[in-house]
Every structure is written in structure tokens, then in C-alpha cells.
Amino acid sequence: KKKEKVKKGSECSEWTWGPCTPSSKDCGMGFREGTCGAQTQRVHCKVPCNWKKEFGADCKYKFESWGACDGSTGTKARQGTLKKARYNAQCQETIRVTKPCTSKTKSKTKAKKGKGKD
């Protein structure tokens, strides 16, 4: 969610805006809801259909291999570096994802699936 400061006299000073949610399907005209204390506001917005078709996901990352299992947490991690973002998507440049350590067979399967995210 995005925060923005709008000063209008004694009104709310900081509105928090949610994502643009299309009224039907996954793109086109829709609404964005804003909240500030007890106040709420809805504004029209538009998710361009061409962007949805082009990118599918807002943020695409290239991931390293999974690290070794951390015995203390029972998880392993890997880092992803931003590869491509939808033009208006405010993506982190790097992300870190974790997953539970599992048996070798399951790990191989999951790692293969993970490569598809590159």
C-alpha cells in the first residue's frame, strides 16, 4: 500500500492507498481505496490491459541457487535480483526467500520449479 500526505485544512494528513483493483477480469477500469483514520475514499483507476498481458507478474527476479540448510531454523534461503518490473511496479531490487528444508527428492523438485521464476 502507498502512503501519501494530503493537507486540506483540518482533514486527514496521511492517506494510505491500496492497489488498483479492476472491476472485472484482471485489467481495465477499477477502483483504488484509500483510508485515513475512520475516513475512506474510492477513486477510479485503470490497470492497462497491455501491461498485464506483457508481464503477467509485476516483479520478476533472477534467483541464485538455494543455500545450505540452516539447522537452527530448519530453513534454507536464496536471493533474487530484480530482472524486470512492470513499468509502474515499485519492486525491491533484491529479495530473499526462504523455504523449509525437506528431503533431497523434494528439494530437487522444488528447486526445478523455482528456476521457472527467472
Epitope: 501519501e4 492507498w17 524486470k84 518490473a85 509502474n88
Partner: antibody, heavy 117, light 107 residues
Framework: QVQLVQSGAEVKKPGHSVKVSCKAS????????MNWVRQAPGQGLEWIGM????????ILNQKFKDKATLTVDISTSTAYMELSSPRSEDTAVYYC??????????WGQGTLVTVSS | EIVLTQSPATLSLSPGERATLSCRAS??????LHWYQQKPGQAPRLLIK???QSISGIPARFSGSGPGTDFTLTISSVEPEDFAVYYC?????????FGGGTKLEIK
Amino acid sequence: QVQLVQSGAEVKKPGHSVKVSCKASGQSFSSYWMNWVRQAPGQGLEWIGMIHPSDSETILNQKFKDKATLTVDISTSTAYMELSSPRSEDTAVYYCSSWSAKRGDFWGQGTLVTVSS
Amino acid sequence: EIVLTQSPATLSLSPGERATLSCRASESISNNLHWYQQKPGQAPRLLIKYASQSISGIPARFSGSGPGTDFTLTISSVEPEDFAVYYCQQSNSWPLTFGGGTKLEIK
């Protein structure tokens, strides 16, 4: 931070194509959209199009679909814009800019292209 | 394409005064509106992104409001270095478009 350095001024005769380069240094060149914008003398800003270095996906302003060609060379972190068959009305300063919705953008210094017979 | 109309075309103010620049979109563009400052012989500089989000290194006197169709760039107290041309740009749909600009000049 990203630094964008553009090629020098060009003087071309009408019909002779011109290629402007934009070399990036600093943060990852391949992660961000590269926009091209032009500004005719004394006029406002006009968007030509953009290209994503990761896969060379290009989105052009329809006005420039037969005029501009955008390319990138990942190995040298350089973006290019080629103007085919330029006319006198294509005389302008051409800018490249690297866009990230999260951090904002960085602009090249601009390249003046003069088309004159 | 989305047309952005900026007003006034020219704004004459003295240093220390408050500047209010307007940008109106021909249709709703949510908060996908950005403000640029350009000085003669220089590339544009991003001041505000997504209607009201501040940019690192830009003085706090610059602020923006939106979303929808009507957007405002406010300079709370104009400094001598602020006299320049200001452009709004939308990134809601292709082609990206710019407003015609507002020239902020010394009164």
C-alpha cells in the same frame, strides 16, 4: 546511482540515418526500462518509446514506429536509438533515461541532432 | 492517447511566495503522474513521482497531490533556483505523454 552518458552532437542531411548511443554505468543496466524522449528547439518533451534491456522488449510511440529503432547491447551496457530518414522537423535534443518506479529515473545529458541540407 | 493540460502557461512569482502548478488529465490516470523540472540547457529532473511520492535529494518544499484527473505541484516557498519550466508526465497508458509545461518566472 546510474550515470548515463550519451554520444556527441550530430549533423545529418535529410534522409541520412543517425544513431545515438547511451552508455550506462553504476547500478544494473539490465533491470530498468530505458526511455527515449526528444525536445525540439524551444518546445516541450515528447516520448519516443522505451526498451527493456533484459529481453529487448520495446514499446514505441506509434508516431515513431517508422522513424525510430531502439536496441541495447547488454555486454557494453549501452542503449541505442536510430532515426531513419530524418527530416528537418526531427531536429531536436534526444535524451535517454533509465526508469525505476521505486527509485525514480536518471537522465543522460542529451544529444543534439541537427537535420539540415 | 491521454492529454495532459498544464496551467498556467506562465507563473510570475517573487522568491518566498507559494507556487501552485496544475496538471489536468483527459481521463483518470490513478496516481500515475510525475513532475519534472527543466532548466535551460539541462535534462529534466524528476521532482515527484506517482502524484505525491518524494524523490531522494529533492528539497521538501516540493510536494504533489492527486490521484484522479487533477494534480497539483506545490512549491511552499519559491527559491531563486526554482525558476524553470515544469512538466507533468503520465505513465498510466501508452504512449507516455507530457504536459505542455508551466514556466515559473521571476516577478
